[in-house]
Each structure stands twice: as structure tokens, then as C-alpha cells.
Interface confidence: low
Amino acid sequence: QSPTPSPTDAYLNASETTTLSPSGSAVISTTTIATTPSKPTCDEKYANITVDYLYNKETKLFTAKLNVNENVECGNNTCTNNEVHNLTECKNASVSISHNSCTAPDKTLILDVPPGVEKFQLHDCTQVEKADTTICLKWKNIETFTCDTQNITYRFQCGNMIFDNKEIKLENLEPEHEYKCDSEILYNNHKFTNASKIIKTDFGSPGEPQIIFCRSEAAHQGVITWNPPQRSFHNFTLCYIKETEKDCLNLDKNLIKYDLQNLKPYTKYVLSLHAYIIAKVQRNGSAAMCHFTTKSAPPSQVWNMTVSMTSDNSMHVKCRPPRDRNGPHERYHLEVEAGNTLVRNESHKNCDFRVKDLQYSTDYTFKAYFHNGDYPGEPFILHHSTSYNSK
């Protein structure tokens, strides 16, 4: 359709001349020269027109909104308020655009209709383990469509950061903070759907408790005191490791001291204390560590003690080490009594004593015990008599 010139399309320049006719009458002749400025073609004017596609979830049809300021005239398709309605997903439609500010040829706009909006879902792909400091957002295709996927582009804006990806990961964020991300999907560079998400990052890991002191002042006991971490937490876990054994306790968040009981004497304990919070997952704070060695205690009794006669007046005394030494050193003691009189008192590195030159035909009491350098153990007592001399 050719545009009709409007009164403002030409500027009139008039010059008036007067001549005498043969009849003698005066003829007034007016010469008018029209100057028309050149208009662009509509194809040129609307070369870079953009389109937004609006989706109707009920009808599952699109409306194409032409981003023009003028009320253009559409051919081939009906435009209402610069919108083309009832477009089917993934089908091409053609619309010609004209306006009285431009000349032929019209702009022929191919509407490459995008896939249905419900076929895309903005998905929070944040790993729960990392949800305290990261956000992940991802567009998912949840149904098939016939459009060319290569023509689909994605855009995210989170604060002042812009990403042209289907999936974004924001890292090194603050725990317990709200972040807003806007996203849109474009098909052939035409926006057809958008979504916004406000995501609050999860509770962060608690800080490390500060151990004030950690010590043992007895053989079976230890104590640890601490200051709690600054950040939110639910409880503490206290682990204590003895050699290869590990025991862990769950402690109330209000505790700042714990007394360890029933410890093994003269044993090094490695303690590790961390706070934790149960958020999207349980988050453990950094562990504070300390060590102590419990005090010595009396060793347990030697066992499997035997007394055997090696000759008329000699005895061989043996025993097995105590199950619990409970101290730094290793020494075995043997006391030999006749009646209430101590007749021998020997000390060896091993529990292997040869007692010679005893009285014949005498009842002896043999007491064997272990000494760990700090404490003696309970004696193992056996009675044995020497025989009459065979000679």
C-alpha cells in the first residue's frame, strides 16, 4: 500500500506575476513549485525492528509485539496495537510493515515464532553443600519442540553482572544474603520469556571455636574449655582420638566446657572441636584441635605368675606383663617373705626371677608386681615351700 502524501509532506513556494492580456484585462498568474524531501523506504526504516513474544498459557499461542513507536500498518497478518496475535509456536509467519513516513517497498518481517514458554523452566541448580556461598540457575528444556535450538540464547542479569549462558554460577557470595537474578530467553534475538528469582544463600559454616585450655590433671580425666564461634550454629561435636580409637560426642550449643571421664591413664588424646549448623545440609565449622596426655596411674596386676623349683633351694618365678601399664617405665619387682620377714627384694626389666640359696623345708610367700616409674601395681601372691635337701 502506497502512502498518501499529507499536507506537511510538501512545502509550497509561490511567486506572483501580472501580465496584460490581448483583451486588455489583467491576468494574474501564480506559479507554484512543490519541493518534497526524500523519505526512507519502509524496508530501510524498519530494518532493525525488534519483536517481543508474549505467550498465552491457556491458548498456548503467542502474540508478537512489534517494538515500534508508530502505529504501523500490517499486511498479510492482522496487527492490533502493533501486535500480531494467535501465532503458533515454531511456525513462521510473515507480516509486512508500512507507514506513511516511509515509502515502498514495505518491510517484510518474518516472525520466527519461538517454542512454548512452558517448555522451559528456570531451575535452581545450586548444590545444597555449596548453597551458603554459591547460586546456580539453569534453564531446563522440559518438553520437546520443533524450533531450531541453535537459535535460542539465554541472558541473565544478577545485580550489575550480565551473563549470556543457559546456566550461571555465582560464587564467593555471602551466606544468609538475598540475591536477585533476572533472566530472559531469546529466540533469533527476540525475547519470548523471562523470569526473576530472589535467592537467599544458606547459613554458612560456623567459625572455628577458640580453645582456651585443654589439659588432663588426673589419670582418668581431662577438661577442655572454649569460646564459641561468632556465626550462627546449632551444636558442637567434640571428638577425642586415642591411638587409633575415635569417640565423638554431640554437645549442647550453650556449653563452653566439657569434662572428659573414664580416660585411659598415661595416654595421649587428640581432641578436635567443631561447631555445626543444620541448614540445607549439615555444615561443620573448622575444627580446633588440642592434645593432652593423661597422668599416670597404678598399673594392673601381673598375671599368669608361676613359681617352680629348679633345685632344692632355688625357685624360678615368672609372670606375664600387666594388661595396663599406665605409666612411662617398665620394672618388675619380686618380694620373697618367710613368715613375716622379707628375705629377698629383687627388681628386673623382665618378669623372670631366679631365687637361689633359700632355706630348705621352708614356706615362702612370693609377691610379684609391676612398677611403671610412678606407681606400683597390685602384687600377685603365690606360696611355695622348699623341700628337704636331697643330699
Epitope: I211, F213, C214, R215, C239, I241, E243, T244, K246, K268, V270, S272, A287, A288, M289, C290, H291, F292, T293
Partner: antibody
Framework: EVQLVESGGDRVQPGRSLTLSCVTS????????MTWIRQVPGKGLEWVAS????????YYPDSVKGRFTISRDNAKNTLYLQMNSLRSEDTATYYC????????????WGQGTSVTVSS | DIQMTQSPPVLSASVGDRVTLSCKAS??????LDWYQQKHGEAPKLLIY???NLQTGIPSRFSGSGSGTDYTLTISSLQPEDVATYYC????????FGSGTKLEIK
Amino acid sequence: EVQLVESGGDRVQPGRSLTLSCVTSGFTFNNYWMTWIRQVPGKGLEWVASISSSGGSIYYPDSVKGRFTISRDNAKNTLYLQMNSLRSEDTATYYCARDERWAGAMDAWGQGTSVTVSS
Amino acid sequence: DIQMTQSPPVLSASVGDRVTLSCKASQNINKNLDWYQQKHGEAPKLLIYETNNLQTGIPSRFSGSGSGTDYTLTISSLQPEDVATYYCYQHNSRFTFGSGTKLEIK
């Protein structure tokens, strides 16, 4: 005789990964905590990672946390250090050591393996 | 994290001298401190564990003492073979080495 032999050191570019191994013999590996220590040539010792005998407790300094992973295979008597996102400041000789008193007193050390991170 | 400060960085002494090396922790480390000796081109060697316990096979001229935040390694009579760098190492709360003291013979 207690022996610790490190291997896996190499020259790598920044951002790349490397895994060090420490094969041990002459002692009951699964009774001991193990530690990785590193030393920049001409500089001091820096603790890198420690792991308990069962592997249930692991500790790292902030300088490697999130990038390095210590692990052990008690069946193979072997200690590992997986190093990701390597930086030039990770260039050092890496030693593995046995902690004689569970979490301290490193009484046996390997000979070290050299890691160079450079573009 | 706990910081360990060793002083002096370099120490020159004569054979037979009594030598004292210092190590200061930024907080109480409850005597959980070891001393290591490293000779040039060698792996470190454990000398003293838990402040004052002499490791098996280490000469008795080496001794350790201290508590709280202040610790000392003493060599009662310096020998030529003691030329090395000495490191303290805390294992009370995570782990930290000191920066080392280089011991030289005058």
C-alpha cells in the same frame, strides 16, 4: 626399616592438577597419622595436610584448603595428595612424614618430590 | 591460625658453646611443640617431641623446655655436626612450623 618414598612430582602449568603418592614400608601404616609438608627451595617448612590413621580426620591450612585433598589407602600402605588449581606459590619440595604420636612428632620422613608450577 | 616466631633467624656460635634457640607461639599451645633439625640437602629430623622429650638416637646435648607460649631448644655444647636449620612445630591447634633458625659455627 621404616621407609617413605614420595613420587609424582613434576613441572605443570598454573591451574593444572597433580597427584603425589607416598609409598610406605617397614611399619604398620594404618596405625599412624600421616602428614604432607612442603619446602620452597631456600625457604622454611610449611605444613600442607594431615590425615588420621583411619582417614576420619583431615586438616588443611587455609593456603591449600579447597584445592588440595589428602587421602590414604591403608590396604596399599600409600598416602596421596591430590593438588588442583595449582599456583606458582605451590612450587616446592613435598615431603611425606609419619606422625609417631598420632598428631605430632614426625619421626620418619621421605626424601621429597619436587613440584614446579610455571607457565 | 597459630603463628610461630623463631629467634634469632641466624645464630653464630663457637664449638663447645651453650646455644639457646627460642620459639614463641601466638597463643598457648599446651606444650604440644616439637623441634626438627634440617641439614643442607636433607629431610628434616625429629630432635625433641612435646617440648622436652628427647627422640631416640638424638645426643643428650640437645634438650627442650618451655610452656604456654614460650619454648626453648638448648644445645649444651655445640658440635661441628650441629650446623643446620632448626624448626619448631606446634601441633596444638592444627599445625604450624616456625620460620627456622640457621645455626652456624664461628
